[in-house]
């Protein structure tokens, strides 16, 4: 009876999400493998988040708008492990917008989700950021490693969206 009611709850939750995400990929997790964590298909999952690599080329504002339409934000990178996971799926000859910007050009960087910008957990390429006119951050592959670079916000780039996992 308990299992039955849990299944019914899950099904109704799935139907609720179905209007936003036609397909979800779920995995069982938790102490008793009773919880399901889901990401929209074909998003990838790492820890408690889902990630989507958008290969359409858009300005930073449009990229954030595009993520937002999907219930996400441009990616906020909190750890080196998270960045290493993300970069596994990136093309080395491309650049991707992050959810990091300096709107006034005062070198006050801020994340889209209001996570405090911590200078100690940043992965700028050597010599970056280097221009107050370049107010948006990308991740790209340079000098044999992935790192961040400041760029003009209106020049179209690919992007990475991030959202919290859906728990049912």
């Amino acid at each position: 009876n308990f299992m039955y009611s849990k299944t019914v709850k899950r099904l109704s939750k799935l139907q609720e999400y179905q209007q936003y995400y036609p397909s979800l990929t779920c995995v069982m997790e938790g102490k008793d493998m009773e919880d399901w964590s889901c990401c929209p298909t074909p998003w990838t999952s790492f820890q408690s988040s889902c990630y989507f690599i958008s290969t359409v080329m858009q300005s930073w504002t449009k990229s954030q708008n595009n993520c937002s339409v999907m219930g996400a934000d441009l990616v906020v990178i909190n750890t080196k492990e998270e960045q290493d996971f993300i970069t596994q799926n990136l093309k080395i000859n491309s650049a991707y917008f992050l959810g990091l910007s300096d709107p006034k050009g005062w070198r006050h960087w801020q994340w889209v989700d209001q996570t405090p910008y911590n200078k100690n957990v940043t992965f700028w390429h050597s010599g970056e950021p280097n221009s107050p006119d370049e107010r948006c951050a990308i991740i790209n592959f340079r000098s044999e490693e992935w790192g961040w670079n400041d760029v003009h916000c209106h020049v179209p780039q690919k992007s990475i969206c991030k959202m919290k996992k859906i728990y049912i």
Partner: antibody, heavy 120, light 107 residues
Framework: DVQLQESGPGLVKPSQSLSLTCSVT?????????WNWIRQFPGNKLECMGY???????YYNPSLKNRISITRDTSKNQFFLSLNSVTTEDTATYFC?????????????WGQGTLVTVSA | DIQMTQSPASLSASVGETVTITCRAS??????LAWYQQKQGKSPQLLVY???TLADGVPSRFSGSGSETQYSLKINSLQPEDFGNYFC?????????FGGGTKLEIK
């Protein structure tokens, strides 16, 4: 004020390469924005061909496959279009255009255009 | 690619009249739409960006509206200098494609 000016041969033979130059005054092409080539066919249809960004990165319209190359010479503040293996279908007026104005919402600066005819 | 369908292809009107040109996108372009005017032998001139904002120096008789996939350009009280070709162009995702154009002729 920013000004763009196209130049190049007006007549190209089929199977040859089309080469055009855009000379920019009033703004350094390596300082910002992205720099496009757009063409307008005889029936007035407009097509974005591709661009070179201020940082030297490129985008090419997939419809042009591997025929297109856009390069630049920052010392002369010029950027270039090369289109290989042209056919009569490439006959058009070619414009160079600055991209990225109004948070990338419209193309405000265009060259006056140069007509290129592909004919034997 | 997003396809832009513009209508009508041609339009005859008299000075003083009001005309409307429409553009339909094959997908939601989130108001990232521009309108241009082009005179014979000249390059296109930006009139409107972001669906409804007039570019610098554009007279207030021009106005843009619309959302999602449907957009329009309205010209109130047509002036002799308004005749020519009009194009829409979306700016949502690269490549930014144009509508087929509307030829506005004097009646």
């Amino acid at each position: 004020d920013v000004q763009l000016q196209e130049s190049g041969p007006g007549l190209v033979k089929p199977s040859q390469s089309l080469s055009l130059t855009c000379s920019v005054t009033g703004y350094s092409i390596s300082s910002g924005y992205y720099w496009n080539w757009i063409r307008q066919f005889p029936g007035n249809k407009l097509e974005c061909m591709g661009y070179i960004s201020y940082d030297g990165s490129n985008y090419y319209n997939p419809s042009l496959k591997n025929r297109i190359s856009i390069t630049r010479d920052t010392s002369k503040n010029q950027f270039f279009l090369s289109l290989n293996s042209v056919t009569t279908e490439d006959t058009a007026t070619y414009f160079c255009v600055r991209g990225g104005d109004y948070d990338d919402g419209g193309f405000a600066y265009w060259g006056q255009g140069t007509l290129v005819t592909v004919s034997a | 690619d997003i396809q832009m369908t513009q209508s009508p292809a041609s339009l005859s009107a008299s000075v003083g009249e009001t005309v409307t040109i429409t553009c339909r996108a094959s997908g939601n372009i989130h108001n990232y739409l521009a309108w241009y005017q082009q005179k014979q032998g000249k390059s296109p001139q930006l009139l409107v960006y972001n669906a409804k904002t007039l570019a610098d120096g554009v007279p207030s008789r021009f106005s843009g509206s619309g959302s999602e996939t449907q957009y329009s350009l309205k010209i109130n009280s047509l002036q002799p200098e308004d005749f020519g070709n009009y194009f829409c162009q979306h700016f949502w995702i690269i490549p930014y494609t144009f509508g087929g154009g509307t030829k506005l002729e004097i009646k």
